[in-house]
Interface confidence: low
């Protein structure tokens, strides 16, 4: 007859460090004292005829435990196979790229520490919920990497590694370990640079918009733009309309800016850059200035009148320029009469680049002369009716300007001129009209003869 | 195209250290293994460890544990291989490998760095 | 470890004629994952190993196709259709399942 020797439980399945308590069993009448043969740590816990319990402690890896005993002479053994699970240590999803180009692949890499048994364990790779990769768990540390080709969605997706040790055949579940999740963050970035509209030329101390707008930019909220005039940085108002992103500020031209620069628009996003450059000129175009030596000038002085402007600028004083680009337009006169009020026009030239540029400058003399009145406004003998409505059309001229009375000789009487008046046989005499100012008097005699209305 | 390239021929003395460069080139270091295989005169090959550069994990042949260290410098795209206490039966050529993954073949080898171990 | 031994020691061919290598592993070579990580290297005389076959039967590229590979578990074999002048070396049996990774004791192919 053949006797068995039983071992339970039969290969059990236990988390690691954990203790199993183990159970020999004969049915051989004439038995010896059972052994248990294995390298793990064990305790006889209690015997009899027969049988023998045994408690193993710290069972921290797969191992087969072996039950012997002689059984009339002869060895008769049994074993079990004990299958230890635990899971991973470490699920650690490696750092993502800081930016990701959209359209081009970036690696998911895993390393998974611990976990066993192996063959039980299967590591996942996710965005949001959504697996990407389902490998099983090779070698320690197991590393697993997934490409993926990253989208505009991905902008802001958590990717995340998950273990899964599949105990559900030993009837213990599933057991799921999960990284903590890394956020990617992807970009388009165009390879066409920005459009930069600034103006040509720029006048020192004079302020102009500066516009610099970049399109097909994602996310466009998250872009930098540096925006200068050489090397003084331009404050720029960025806004943003969908992928198009526009920078707009106002350049102003230092006179230690003058000359040829460089206004730059910079975007940078993802860590990578794009670059629109124009060039400007920076000018400083001072005058024209026109100058009198006498801003007021008596009769029969001498006046000078110059006109200037900075250097490279050509001036033209009323038709007559200057010897050369950066020098002064003279010209000199004898003030007459007829000078008073005069205009001195100064016209100034700048060359920018092949561009010219114009400026216009005037002034006004002023002629001090004495009072006169114009004798052919001023009829010396008037013939008019009476009871009829007249005008006596004197004018006076000179600077200071004079004022004028027509007085009549041997009375006070005056008559208004330049204004309507009823004339009378009394306005019948002889006038002095009297141009008086602080520059003295002119007189002239005029005489009026009324003609007396006739009843029938 | 894809090479290692290692670092010239070595003579030491019994107790000495060593250390063997191989630089990658042609490929992205960090994606790849890296991997150590000794052959001495006249013999088979023996493989003595492993590196991942990019996470600067290593695993070691039970034989050499302790005696060798591989490290990885992934700005230079390089990785190195220090053997210490060397003894006679060091004397060997030490090959650098790589393999795309695990647990896959080595498809590519440096050209090899002769350490001779002699007193 | 896995222990691999290959056989013949030494293969004495003429050129054109086939050859073929054997390997046996001391343990089963099949992964957990269903792959079989078994590969054929090449050492020319002077130079390092280079890569023949990997996965039993995957030829790596620019291998000619007079070269194969099959097995499985335990047993694998590496042949020749047309051994050429440019064939002759040692060649090595290596596996990657378990660690440490191991290689066969090599098979020189010489010219008879």
């Known amino acids: 007859q053949e006797f068995l020797l039983r071992v339970e439980p039969q290969n059990p399945v236990l988390s690691a460090g954990g203790s199993l308590f183990v159970n020999c069993s004969t049915d051989c009448p004439s038995s010896e004292k059972i052994a248990l043969e294995t390298s793990l740590s064990k305790e006889l816990v209690a015997s009899g005829m027969g049988w023998a319990a045994f408690n193993l402690s710290n069972v921290t890896g797969n191992s087969r435990i072996l039950c012997s005993v002689y059984c009339n002479g002869s060895q008769i053994t049994g074993s079990s196979n004990i299958t230890v699970y635990g899971l991973p240590e470490r699920v650690e999803l490696a750092p993502l790229p800081p930016w990701q180009p959209v359209g081009q692949n970036f690696t998911l890499r895993c390393q998974v520490e611990g976990g066993s048994p192996r063959t039980s364990l299967t590591v996942v790779l996710l965005r949001w919920e959504e697996e990407l990769s389902r490998q099983p768990a090779v070698e320690e540390p197991a590393e697993v990497t997934a490409t993926v080709l990253a989208s505009r969605d991905d902008h802001g997706a958590p990717f995340s590694c998950r273990t899964e040790l599949d105990m559900q055949p030993q009837g213990l579940g599933l057991f799921v370990n999960t990284s903590a999740p890394r956020q990617l963050r992807t970009f388009v970035l165009p390879v066409t640079p920005p459009r930069l509209v600034a103006p040509r030329f720029l006048e020192v101390e004079t302020s102009w918009p500066v516009d610099c707008t970049l399109d097909g930019l994602f996310p466009a909220s998250e872009a930098q733009v540096y925006l200068a005039l050489g090397d003084q940085m331009l404050n720029a108002t960025v806004m943003n309309h969908g992928d198009t992103l526009t920078a707009t500020a106002t350049a102003t031209a230092r006179a230690d800016q003058e000359g040829a620069r460089e206004i730059v628009c910079n975007v940078t996003l993802g860590g990578e850059r794009r670059e629109a450059r124009e060039n400007l000129t920076v000018f400083s175009f001072l005058g024209p200035i026109v100058n009198l030596s006498e801003p007021t000038a008596h009769e029969g002085s001498t006046v000078t009148v110059s006109c200037m402007a900075g250097a490279r600028v050509q001036v033209t004083l009323d038709g007559v320029p200057a010897a050369a680009p950066g020098q002064t337009a003279q010209l000199q006169l004898n003030a007459t009469e007829s000078d008073d009020g005069r205009s001195f026009f100064c016209s100034a030239t700048l060359e920018v680049d092949g561009e010219f540029l114009h400026r216009n400058s005037s002034v006004q003399l002023r002629v001090l002369y004495g009072p006169k009145i114009d004798r052919a406004t001023c009829p010396q003998h008037l013939k008019w009716k009476d009871k009829t409505r007249h005008v006596l059309q004197c004018q006076a001229r000179g600077n200071p300007y004079p004022e004028l009375r027509c007085l009549k000789e041997g009375s006070s009487r005056e008559v208004p001129v330049g204004i309507p008046f009823f004339v009378n046989v009394t306005h019948n005499g002889t006038y002095q009209c009297q141009a008086s100012s602080s520059r003295g008097k002119y007189t002239l005699v005029v005489v009026m003869d009324i003609e007396a209305f006739s009843s029938h | 195209q894809i090479q290692l390239v290692q670092s010239g021929a070595e003579v030491k003395k019994p107790g000495a250290s060593v250390k063997v460069s191989c630089k990658a080139s042609g490929y992205t270091f960090t994606d790849c293994i890296i991997l150590w295989v000794r052959q001495a005169p006249g013999q088979g090959l023996e493989w003595m460890g492993k590196i991942n550069p990019y996470f600067g994990t290593t695993t070691y042949a039970q034989k050499f544990q302790g005696r060798v260290t591989i490290t990885a410098d992934t700005s230079t795209s390089t990785a190195y291989m220090e053997l210490s206490s060397l003894r006679s039966e060091d004397t060997a050529v030490y090959y650098c490998a790589r393999k795309e993954a695990y647990p896959d073949a080595m498809d590519y080898w440096g050209q090899g760095t002769l350490v001779t171990v002699s007193s | 470890d896995a222990v691999m031994t290959q056989t013949p020691l030494s293969l004495p061919v003429s050129l054109g004629d086939q050859a073929s290598i054997s390997c046996r592993s001391s343990q089963s070579l099949v992964h957990s994952n269903g792959d079989t990580y078994l590969h054929w290297y090449l050492q020319k005389p002077g130079q390092s190993p280079q890569l023949l076959i990997y996965?039993?039967?995957n030829r790596f590229s620019g291998v000619p196709d007079r070269f194969s590979g099959s097995g499985s578990g335990t047993d694998f074999t590496l042949k020749l259709s047309r051994v050429e002048a440019e064939d002759l070396g040692v060649y090595f049996c290596?596996?990657?399942?378990?660690?440490?990774?191991?290689f066969g004791g090599g098979t020189k192919l010489e010219i008879k």
């Open positions: 290596s596996q990657s399942t378990h660690v440490p990774y191991t």
């Open positions: 996965k039993v039967s």
